[in-house]
């Protein structure tokens, strides 16, 4: 709407707001090392902190829920940080007839923003 | 993936998934009463609940994230519950040359998934 | 400094074999995939394949499949292009090229190996 | 016959901007992410945009790059004489994997 203006500072401090965050994971903490081959250890882009008052709303939806929330914080939820865009990412794994490569596009967040 | 499989039964008891409420909020709630003129009255339907593993997964991301989560919870958020599509509205509101109509595609949650 | 240095141009019989060579350096070998791509005189660019030096696992263009083999020894950071038996058809420029971070795009790339093919 | 289809050749003066093309299909640009590479005469590859519109470090930002439906293309402003060179687009195709377009070779005029 034109009368509520998503902002990009954080005001709790830095780090602490919605942000994209990489965590290191193994074939083995993802359940997959008994189809995916490779890369054996993947860069796991994921949104994390947390959402204050207008802060990265990803739409009207969304800036209407951070002022229930502020409103009714039992009733409505705060928004959350959730990935606004994907980067694809190439897997090896095993077929039946051996290895083959394979896209994903929404494994990866390349974007956050509070929804 | 082809070994995660996102689940619709909600594991913790009716109601504390994610799933879609209605909540009613006037337009002195929003602060959108100086310039929208109707409805007065919104049914603003939200996404809200918990997001237990596997749980109406958006995607690839939201699976990982919850495997994760189940790894690293310090490190790694839970999925949450955030709307998977949008139903549009139509507001009345003041203009300099007087009224108009204007659709909002992304006010109103019409869906919600786990992401 | 991430480098992929090539093998020397070779000049070669029809029916003979060779191996070429793309030796990685500044980088943790293992952790990124290796392809190789083709380009014939006055041609555009071909990719034939790529390795994953750490568990060797290859995969192959259809357009090259039983043309080519390509390995990696991962105690000297190089990986390999051969042949079993040249054709005339197999002169080209060689380059093996490195796979960036989610396996997309290639982000280095060797200097290049010329082989040339004549009886 | 590649996969992807860019024009042969462009041309352009000193300081002009040109454009050079990318066209392919659902089931490549369509679906993943565009890079283009540069490859100046006599010389390997060398990576210009990467996931449509990304530059790495050290590429000026006279290069950019954008991808709308199934086709995608690099723009280059200020031409430079240093400019005048081959230039592929690259993806993915769920058939041959890594794709190529056939390379469009930038003549720099004057």
């Known amino acids: 709407s034109a009368h509520l203006h998503p902002r990009d500072s954080c005001p709790l401090g830095p780090g602490r707001c919605c942000h994209l965050e990489t965590v290191q994971a193994t074939l083995e903490d993802l359940g997959w090392s008994d189809w995916v081959l490779s890369p054996r250890q993947l860069q796991l882009s994921m949104c994390v902190g947390e959402c204050p008052h207008l802060y990265r709303s990803a739409n009207t939806h969304a800036l209407i829920k951070a002022r229930l929330h502020g409103l009714q914080p039992d009733r409505v939820p705060a928004p959350c940080c959730v990935p606004s865009s994907y980067t694809p990412v190439v897997l090896m794994h095993r077929t039946d007839s051996g290895v083959s490569l394979q896209t994903y596009d929404d494994l990866v967040a390349q974007g956050c923003h509070c929804a | 993936s082809a070994h995660l499989h996102p689940r619709d039964s909600c594991p913790l008891g009716p109601g504390r998934c994610c799933h879609l409420e209605t909540v009613q909020a006037t337009l002195e709630d929003l602060g959108w009463s100086d310039w929208v003129l109707s409805p007065r009255q919104l049914q603003l339907s939200m996404c809200v609940g918990e997001c237990p593993h596997l749980y109406r997964s958006a995607n690839t991301h939201a699976l990982i994230k919850a495997r994760l989560h189940g790894l690293q919870p310090d490190r790694v958020p839970a999925p949450c519950c955030v709307p998977s599509s949008y139903t549009p509205v139509v507001l009345m509101h003041r203009t300099d040359s007087g009224v108009s109509l204007q659709t909002y595609d992304d006010l109103v949650a019409q869906g919600c998934h786990c992401a | 400094e991430v480098q992929l240095v090539q093998s020397g141009a070779e000049v070669k019989k029809p029916g003979e074999s060779l191996k070429i060579s793309c030796k990685g350096s500044?980088?943790?070998?293992?952790?990124?995939?290796i392809g190789w791509v083709r380009q014939m005189p006055g041609k555009g660019l071909e990719w034939m394949g790529v390795?994953?030096?750490?568990?060797?696992?290859?995969i192959y263009s259809p357009s090259f499949q039983g043309q080519v083999t390509i390995s990696a020894d991962k105690s000297i950071s190089t990986a390999y292009l051969q042949w079993s038996s040249l054709k005339a058809s197999d002169t080209a420029m060689y380059y093996c090229?490195?796979?960036?971070?989610?396996?997309?795009?290639?982000?280095?790339w060797g200097q290049g190996t010329l082989v040339t093919v004549s009886s | 016959q590649s996969v992807l289809t860019q024009p042969p050749s462009v041309s352009g003066a000193p300081g002009q901007r040109v454009t050079i093309s990318c066209s392919g299909s659902?089931?490549?640009?369509?679906?993943?992410?565009v890079n283009w590479y540069q490859q100046l005469p006599g010389t390997a590859p060398k990576l210009l945009i990467y996931?449509?519109?990304n530059r790495p470090s050290g590429v000026p930002d006279r290069f950019s790059g954008s991808k709308s439906g199934t086709s995608a293309s690099l723009a280059i402003t200020g031409l430079q004489a240093e400019d005048e060179a081959d230039y592929y687009c690259?993806?993915?195709?769920?058939?041959?994997?890594?794709?190529f377009g056939g390379g469009t070779k930038l003549t720099v005029l004057g």
């Open positions: 090229a490195r796979y960036g971070r989610y396996g997309t795009y290639f982000d280095y």
């Open positions: 500044g980088y943790s070998f293992t952790s990124y995939w």
């Open positions: 390795i994953d030096p750490g568990g060797s696992y290859t």
């Open positions: 659902s089931s490549n640009i369509g679906v993943l992410y």
């Open positions: 996931s449509n519109d």
């Open positions: 690259q993806s993915w195709d769920s058939s041959s994997n890594y794709v």
